[in-house]
Amino acid sequence: MKVLQEPTCVSDYMSISTCEWKMNGPTNCSTELRLLYQLVFLLSEAHTCIPENNGGAGCVCHLLMDDVVSADNYTLDLWAGQQLLWKGSFKPSEHVKPRAPGNLTVHTNVSDTLLLTWSNPYPPDNYLYNHLTYAVNIWSENDPADFRIYNVTYLEPSLRIAASTLKSGISYRARVRAWAQCYNTTWSEWSPSTKWHNSYREPFEQH
């Protein structure tokens, strides 16, 4: 049994780090493998993560970490029984993938303005709470070419757009994702999408 693709890990900078790797053949990850992780700190002990299958030869492990501080550094040991398959290290603050925003809502009753709001995925005491910016993706269910991205570079989790920038009488979907420049994070996963029917009064044309 060998590791084909070494573990790579990302942290949500809150409570979970996720490590993924590939073995050289079909593996029952939960029965055959264990990922041990230990904070580099004199008084720490190793914690065990039981991996799950992620495709035939792929494994994924969710490491519980309460929370993260920037100095944290972990040693990682991947074991198959008594055999050490791989040894590495992981600094969560250098590999951050934020949690996805939630509760995306489209408010269509504000004159001819669309107001999109969503929830920050972090509690106020988490460092990332005040450092997230967002990208909102809006697309038409009828027209694949009608696909747009709005960058929200301010902290407030909301976006206002004129309903008239979209076509009237058709259905649209929206989703949102987040990232934090301070830790040069990757983008979060997209939030679940929400759907609405776009309709607005065409401005009266005078001839």
């Epitope: 720490s44 002990e45 914690h47 100095a71 944290d72």
Partner: antibody, heavy 121, light 106 residues
Framework: EVHLLESGGGFIQPGGSLRLSCAAS????????MNWVRLAPGKGLEWVST????????SYTDSVQGRFTISRDNSKNKLYLQINNLTAEDTAVYYC??????????????WGQGALVTVSS | DIQMTQSPSSLSASAGDRVTITCRAS??????LNWYQQKPGKAPKLLIY???SLQSGVPSRFSGSGSGTDFTLTISSLQPEDSATYYC????????FGQGTRLEIK
């Protein structure tokens, strides 16, 4: 709500022994390292000992090494400190304290009310 | 062993004052530095962990900074209830405490 309650303190003669206990509730006891810290009269806080969540790892400050033994019973949510060969310098209020994080290294977020140990002839 | 040195050992200040307590480690401890408040007859209370993170429920007038060997606890606007002894603690190695700073309100 997290609660830590020490017991077993008292008045003891030099050279004597006693066992301090700390009853824990309100959190998953077995996943957190636990600690003993003491405050001697007119002195500052002194870390005494740490035990890992599983009980497999223990550590002590130099002045108590070989005389003090930390242990835990995860089935009873209890932490212990066995103190042997007591000296006057061991007179202090002894606190049990919970690690803030499962992985450690960010201090102690919950403390008991303390147990007074007085060593005197 | 890592030694922690706090200064000053005591200070007196008035309500509303900005107060700073410093802590120096004998070697680099990264940001593994915590601050506690202890009042007579009471258990210590965690104020700041990891040098600058405010523990839940602690008033925002308390803040911490620093990394490596030099750290600071700041109380931005002193309140009467802040009269206490303050301790720094490193948790990079064995959990050494500083000797404490006794803060008195004038």
């Amino acid at each position: 709500e997290v609660h830590l309650l020490e017991s077993g303190g008292g008045f003891i003669q030099p050279g004597g022994s006693l066992r301090l206990s700390c009853a824990a509730s309100g959190f998953t006891f077995s996943t957190y390292a636990m600690n003993w810290v003491r405050l001697a009269p007119g002195k500052g806080l002194e870390w005494v000992s740490t035990i890992s969540g599983s009980g497999g790892f223990t550590s002590y400050t130099d002045s108590v090494q070989g005389r003090f033994t930390i242990s835990r019973d995860n089935s009873k949510n209890k932490l212990y400190l066995q103190i042997n060969n007591l000296t006057a310098e061991d007179t202090a209020v002894y606190y049990c304290a919970k690690d803030r994080r499962i992985v450690g290294a960010t201090g102690f977020d919950y403390w008991g009310q303390g147990a007074l140990v007085t060593v005197s002839s | 062993d890592i030694q922690m040195t706090q200064s000053p050992s005591s200070l007196s200040a008035s309500a509303g004052d900005r107060v700073t307590i410093t802590c120096r480690a004998s070697q680099s401890i990264s940001s593994y530095l915590n601050w506690y408040q202890q009042k007579p007859g009471k258990a210590p209370k965690l104020l700041i962990y990891a040098a600058s993170s405010l523990q839940s429920g602690v008033p925002s007038r308390f803040s911490g900074s620093g990394s490596g060997t030099d750290f600071t606890l700041t109380i931005s606007s002193l309140q009467p209830e802040d009269s206490a002894t303050y301790y720094c603690q490193q948790s990079y190695g064995f959990h050494t405490f500083g000797q404490g700073t006794r803060l008195e309100i004038k």
